[in-house]
């Protein structure tokens, strides 16, 4: 079954290469287990950035080497992606699956365009 997922159109990463955005899904029921996948689309290529599952009300559990962190609140997932550089600029798409209880739902957002600008190196001071 399809489900609506909303996310901001544009986000600018900080000078430290950190970008945060909210992924909100229109849950038709009371999901207790949710899987969230962040995908990056650039130059018509789509790659998985990170994925996590969480029990409602708990923190998101990403893999140890993940560049993502996140928290959940109701039907909202607050995602933070770290270590971004200018070459990582692209469309970051939120995919949400309601794993339990049945019925299973899946929704894919329209994506958040994340712009990353590499900081200028500090000039040498004599």
């Amino acid at each position: 079954k399809a489900m609506h997922v909303a996310q901001p159109a544009v986000v600018l990463a900080s000078s430290r290469g950190i970008a945060s955005f909210v992924c909100e899904y229109a849950s038709p029921g009371k999901a207790t287990e949710v899987r969230v996948t962040v995908l990056r689309q650039a130059d018509s290529q789509v790659t998985e950035v990170c994925a996590a599952t969480y029990m409602m009300g708990n923190e998101l559990t990403f893999l140890d080497d993940s560049i993502c962190t996140g928290t959940s609140s109701g039907n909202q997932v607050n995602l933070t992606i770290q270590g971004l550089r200018a070459m990582d600029t692209g469309l970051y798409i939120c995919k949400v699956e309601l794993m339990y209880p049945p019925p299973y739902y899946l929704g894919i957002g329209n994506g958040t365009q994340i712009y990353v600008i590499d900081p200028e190196p500090c000039p040498d001071s004599d």
Epitope: T37, L39, V46, I93, L106
Partner: nanobody, 119 residues
Framework: KVQLVESGGGLVQAGGSLRLSCAAP????????MGWFRQAPGKGREFVAD????????YYADSVKGRFTVSRDNAKNTVYLQMNSLKPEDTAVYYC????????????WGQGTQVTVSS
Amino acid sequence: KVQLVESGGGLVQAGGSLRLSCAAPGRTFSNYAMGWFRQAPGKGREFVADIRWSDGRTYYADSVKGRFTVSRDNAKNTVYLQMNSLKPEDTAVYYCAAQGGVLSGWDYWGQGTQVTVSS
């Protein structure tokens, strides 16, 4: 259109085992995630397990974790669901599904195979 063909369902006693197979004749799964779902009478469709074709990463529903194992055979273009320690509550029609890509939903479905666990 991708045709998914399931087999391996049947009647088994509680505590027994079954292995379901899902094949896509003449089709490569290289860009797909493959999943298993089930539906008991009068209930919604329930996620059981899935596997990413590229790296073999798996994910299981809590209700089957430790009892069911999903695997793939690239050469045979087939995905399996090994079901051990079956319980009466596992009784359902089991469906195989395929995702056509990371930005896809579960686009392709098999016809379903009945699994009945008697007590």
